[in-house]
């Protein structure tokens, strides 16, 4: 079970974009081409932004997450990649408290980026109301940031 106390809740994002740091037995069964990853990210980006904007507008007064400089990208020269397995449990956890239909679309896209043999982390919501809102906000903010980092890297790398 991942802890949601303090910064530990962001453990998910340490693996967010680092396919290249994972051992070979965790690699996806079908390695996606950069063009495929870019296409998925371009589909995810407006959904992620929309969810974040909706949530911020509804939850006025929540502080901005100060965990913006996460090691989202691999420093390796290979293709940076979103680890769908690491992120999926978080979106599954927040679905009942968010826009069901948009989350479903995000889950479908993340599933394409899933590492087949990697066990999924178990994620539960913080019980405290304020903590829970912060948790959802942080997931949405960090996911949006992660997508931007990967897209930037893909665009600047070899096409």
């Amino acid at each position: 079970m991942l802890s949601h106390a303090g910064p530990a809740r962001f453990a998910l994002f340490l693996l967010c974009c680092m396919e290249t740091l994972l051992p070979s037995h965790m690699a996806p069964t079908h390695r996606l081409q950069p063009s495929d990853v870019r296409k998925i990210i371009l589909e995810l980006r407006p959904m992620s932004k929309g969810l974040l904007q909706d949530y911020v507008s509804k939850e006025i007064g929540l502080p901005e997450s100060n965990h913006s400089s996460l090691p989202c990208l691999s420093s390796d020269s290979q293709l940076p990649h979103i680890n769908g397995s690491a992120i999926l449990p978080y979106f599954r956890a927040i679905r009942p408290l968010s826009d069901k239909n948009t989350i479903d679309k995000i889950i479908e896209q993340l599933d394409k980026l899933k590492f087949q043999r990697e066990p999924e982390a178990e994620v539960s919501m913080p019980a405290d109301n304020f903590e829970r809102k912060n948790f959802i906000l942080a997931v949405l903010q960090q996911f949006s940031a992660c997508l931007e980092h990967v897209l930037q890297s893909l665009n600047s790398g070899p096409q």
Epitope: L88, F91, R92, A93, R95, P96, L97, K100, I103, D104, I107, E108, D111, E120, V123, S124, M125, N129, R132
Partner: antibody
């Protein structure tokens, strides 16, 4: 698009068992609960239980405990509902329906077409 | 288990009418700041269809004349301007606690 396709109608004798399937497509099968419900003729909806295909976890309505078994086959994206010791009161339309993705139960947004089970001697 | 009571049990109305159906739960269905109350429509001989989820969210593809409100134990489904195709049975359902339970239908 999301589709839940159920097996056809069944006629069973009292005391027998029935096994119905629900084949899912168009979404990531292992991340969503599948609920089973039934509706007797001219009656309301009754929830029977759910299964989470990702780990095979189940929860049954006490009304059906001991008679109901839910199983999932992730290789074929199919969920099975088996009801044993059938009686005439079990005559109903049986539905599968997709639920939520977490321990927090959610609405059932996609439904199978239903499978009519008739129990008669 | 949470008991769900709908009222009225049946009603007759004309096209263009504003229709309200209420649902009362025997205990609160709120959790995490959200009401886990949902509304379904079932036309004769057809499969139930999700209309409103979590008290007030309109399901994708459902006409905007349908709306839901309420929290805690008391909930309402409103059809702002009735259409002939709205003739159906409407069910409320809670998902806050197992067993999941439905109202008897309107």
């Amino acid at each position: 698009q999301v589709l839940l396709v159920q097996s056809g109608a069944e006629v069973k004798k009292p005391g027998a068992s029935v096994k119905i399937f629900c084949k899912a497509s168009g979404y990531s099968f292992t991340y969503y609960d599948i609920n089973w419900l039934r509706q007797a003729p001219e009656q309301g909806l009754e929830w029977m239980g759910w299964i989470f295909p990702g780990d095979g976890g189940t929860k049954y309505n006490e009304t059906f405990k001991g008679r109901l078994t839910l199983t999932a086959d992730t290789s074929t994206n199919t969920v099975y509902m088996e009801l044993s010791s059938l009686r005439s009161a079990d005559t109903a339309m049986y539905y599968c329906a997709r639920g939520g993705t977490s321990v927090i139960r959610d609405a059932m947004d996609y439904w199978g077409q239903g499978a009519l089970v008739t129990v008669s001697s | 288990e949470i008991q769900m009571t709908q009222s009225p049990s049946s009603l007759s109305a004309s096209p263009g009418d504003r229709v309200t159906i209420t649902c009362r739960a025997s205990e609160s269905v709120d959790n995490y700041g959200i009401s886990f109350m949902h509304w379904y429509q079932q036309k004769p001989g057809k499969v139930p269809k999700l209309l409103i989820y979590r008290a007030s969210n309109l399901e994708s593809g459902v006409p905007s004349r349908f709306s839901g409100s309420g929290s805690g134990t008391d909930f309402t489904l409103t059809i702002s301007s009735l259409e002939p195709e709205d003739a159906a049975t409407y069910y409320c359902q809670q998902s806050n606690k197992d067993p999941l339970t439905f109202g008897q239908g309107t």
